[in-house]
């Protein structure tokens, strides 16, 4: 356990031309504060990703009025420290976000009106009990110096502050679950790390790396109740205290999600989706109102509807989650029609559309056939965005500029013979057949079988396709 | 004891404009949002917004947008909506409340739009 | 935005009978409703929020019900003064929205 702390020097317009004059805008005069976020890691953490070592809100500043032909000054600021406390182990490695945040307090409609006027990104090793480290950040046209540091509380040592020590003075005995340190301090150092993953509720360990569990529990990770590790119809590692086999161990097994949390699983991990008045890697935080500033991402902070939640966040569009943490994945709505591959770029969706397709949603099938129609009387079929052209009789070919033989592909029946003809073919009939194309035939009492011959023309006789 | 206290009747002619008031009283007025509903004669309800006095955040139903306005005086512990634009479809009762647990109303506010 | 279907629009029901009145939300709203009774010429009144939980002083014949997107109001043994319009509340999400209300009469 410990707290990062963190002391804001000044803030004010960075050297160079083109800097501001004053963080206020026209309407009048403003004050500033600031907005601290620790993440683990030195990765490049998606911005929307939470703040799961903790954020906290500094106080106000006092109120900043600009004075007109003054050169522009350092900011004033708030006083004392933004300190941001931690339960577990100080991770050494994190990402500290400062956002510096303008009040303004003009005649806005609604109140105070926020906005973010700076906002900067370090990625840093810092070991928890070493000195202030001081930086200096651009951010656009403004300059952030600021100092910070990581220490240890409640009895904790160590560069992590995973050592639990007692000062010299206390009995040297040490409490349960506590083992003496070297002999040359009167300390006590935490007890052995248990194997990972092991259930902090209900099990325990007397060598690194084991796992044991209390009575009513089992499982390699002590996570599954003993009532339920009955030998029917379970799969997966044997249990050395039972003899059953138990399920193997998942990210979300005896739920890591406090509070009502509902976890799911990730690749290697785990996520818990937090109900409303509750944050955190493991919606351990709660308590928090807006003056924790616990919307993410410009989410508008407002009171909550239940005794349980003190404060409702407002996401703005892209955002979701009970702190705006969680980018919406829009794509997963298959906004895209025809085929079209979703591109999520974070201020806006696009659809890559595919050929033949067009519009913001690929929703419009383009027409091949427009300005270029098809020859000799065809008409133009529009299908998957490709051109088509369907041929008057004797004319093919992709724009139907080709002439075709009409009868090349036999099409009288029954012997018929076919001869072209200026719209089309014609089929003259063996004797005894009848029909456009000689289908049918003729019965020897001269009447003909269904359908009819047209009035006027006898069996025989040569018959058009029209 | 929490009780809300809203204006009168107003009757205004179309495409007027008309702000409501309701006076809070019995509670922290920071503490909690303020909503405004709409119910209509004879009609159901209709969330119109809220605003959180504690910072002046404010949610809008995208069908008032440009309808409604909140606002909040904290010194007077007192939320307005003014209205814009009347016509006759916006005659109805306007209640401000607190729609949290308790749920608290006020008497409501009669608007009539007429010529 | 999410939209409240309730039924029945209206009950005719004799007294001490059991009455239950039905919302349906358009997705799942985890829970955050709240039903309201409302009698001629009056406020609204709460009775229910989070689904099930009763406000203080409201009698407990009323109770809510429901998970997912299907709640429920029931009034275990209707009395004369529970005569009114009932209506749900959904505040999962903004636009907070209220089913069309139920008309309840005695036979």
């Known amino acids: 356990a410990g707290v990062f702390e963190l002391q804001i020097h000044s803030f004010g317009p960075g050297p160079g031309p083109g800097a501001p004059r004053s963080p206020c805008s026209a309407r009048g005069p403003c004050r500033l504060f600031f907005r601290v976020c620790l993440k683990p890691g030195l990765s490049e953490e998606a911005a929307e990703s939470p703040c799961a070592l903790g954020a906290a809100l500094s106080a106000r500043g006092p109120v900043y009025t600009e004075q007109p032909e003054a050169p522009a000054p350092d900011l004033p600021l708030p006083n004392g420290l933004l300190q941001v406390p931690f339960r577990d182990a100080w991770p050494g490695t994190f990402s500290l976000i400062i956002e510096t945040w303008r009040e303004e307090l003009g005649d806005q409609i609604g109140g105070p009106a926020w906005s973010l006027l700076a906002r900067v990104t370090r990625r840093r090793r810092l070991a928890a009990g070493g000195p202030w480290a001081r930086d200096i950040q651009r951010a656009g046209a403004w300059e952030l110096r600021f100092s910070y540091r990581a220490r240890c509380e409640l009895l904790a040592v160590g560069t992590a502050c995973t050592r639990l020590c007692r000062p010299r003075s206390a009995p040297s005995r040490c409490g349960p679950g506590l083992r003496p340190c070297a002999p040359l301090e009167d300390e006590c150092e935490a007890p052995p790390v248990c194997r990972a993953g092991c259930s902090l509720e209900h099990g325990f360990c007397e060598q690194p790396g084991e796992c044991r569990c209390l009575e009513g529990w089992t499982g390699p990770l002590c996570t599954v109740p003993a009532s339920t590790s009955s030998c029917l119809g379970l799969r997966g590692p044997s249990s050395a205290t039972t003899g059953c086999l138990v399920p193997g161990p998942g990210p979300c097994d005896g739920n890591p999600c406090a509070n009502g949390g509902s976890c799911s699983e990730t690749p290697g991990s785990f996520e818990c989706t937090c109900p409303r008045g509750f944050y955190g890697l493991r919606c351990e935080v709660s308590g928090v109102t807006c003056a924790d500033g616990p919307c993410f991402n410009g989410g508008l902070c407002v009171g909550g509807a239940d005794p349980d939640s003190a404060y409702i966040c407002h996401c703005p569009p892209g955002f979701q989650g009970s702190n705006c943490e969680k980018r919406v994945d829009r794509c997963s709505l298959q906004p895209c029609r025809n085929g079209g591959l979703c591109l999520d770029l974070g201020h806006a969706l696009r659809c890559r559309c595919r050929a033949g397709f067009a519009g913001p949603r690929c929703e419009h099938n383009l027409d091949d056939c427009a300005g270029r129609a098809c020859a000799n009387g065809g008409t133009c079929v529009e299908g998957g965005g490709a051109h088509r052209c369907s041929c008057a009789l004797g004319f093919g070919g992709r724009d139907c500029r080709e002439r075709a033989d009409p009868c090349a592909a036999r099409p009288c029946a029954h012997g018929g013979r076919c001869y072209a003809h200026f719209s089309g073919l014609v089929c003259a009939c063996a004797p005894g057949y009848m029909g456009s194309r000689c289908e049918f035939p003729v019965h020897p009492d001269g009447v003909s079988a269904l359908p009819a011959a047209p009035p006027g023309l006898r069996p025989g006789d040569p018959q058009r396709y029209l | 004891e929490v009780q809300f206290q809203q204006s009168g009747p107003e009757l205004v002619k179309p495409g007027a404009s008309v702000k409501i008031s309701c006076k809070a009283s019995g509670y922290t007025f920071t503490d909690y949002n303020i909503h405004w509903v709409r119910q209509s004669q004879g009609k159901s309800l209709e969330w119109i917004g809220l605003?959180?006095?504690?910072?002046?955040?404010?949610v809008y139903n995208q069908k008032f947008k440009s309808k409604a306005t909140l606002t909040v005086d904290n010194s007077s512990t007192s939320a307005y909506m003014e209205l814009r634009s009347l016509s006759s479809e916006d005659s109805a009762v306007y209640f401000c409340?607190?729609?949290?647990?308790?749920?608290?109303w006020g008497q409501g506010s009669t608007l009539i739009v007429s010529s | 935005d999410i939209k409240m279907t309730q039924s029945p629009s209206s009950i005719y029901a004799f007294l001490g009978e059991r009455v239950t009145i039905t919302c349906k939300a358009s997705q799942d709203i985890n829970s955050y409703l709240s039903w309201f009774q409302q009698k001629p010429g009056k406020s609204p009144k709460t009775l229910i929020y989070r689904a099930n939980r009763l406000v203080g002083g409201v009698p407990s014949r009323f109770s809510g019900s429901g998970s997912g997107q299907d709640y429920s109001l029931t009034i275990s043994s209707l009395e004369y003064e529970d005569v009114g319009d009932y209506y749900c509340?959904?505040?999962?999400?903004?636009?907070?929205?209220f089913g069309g209300g139920t008309k309840l009469e005695i036979k």
């Open positions: 509340l959904q505040y999962a999400e903004f636009p907070y929205t």
């Open positions: 409340a607190r729609l949290n647990w308790e749920g608290y």
């Open positions: 605003i959180y006095p504690f910072n002046g955040g404010i």
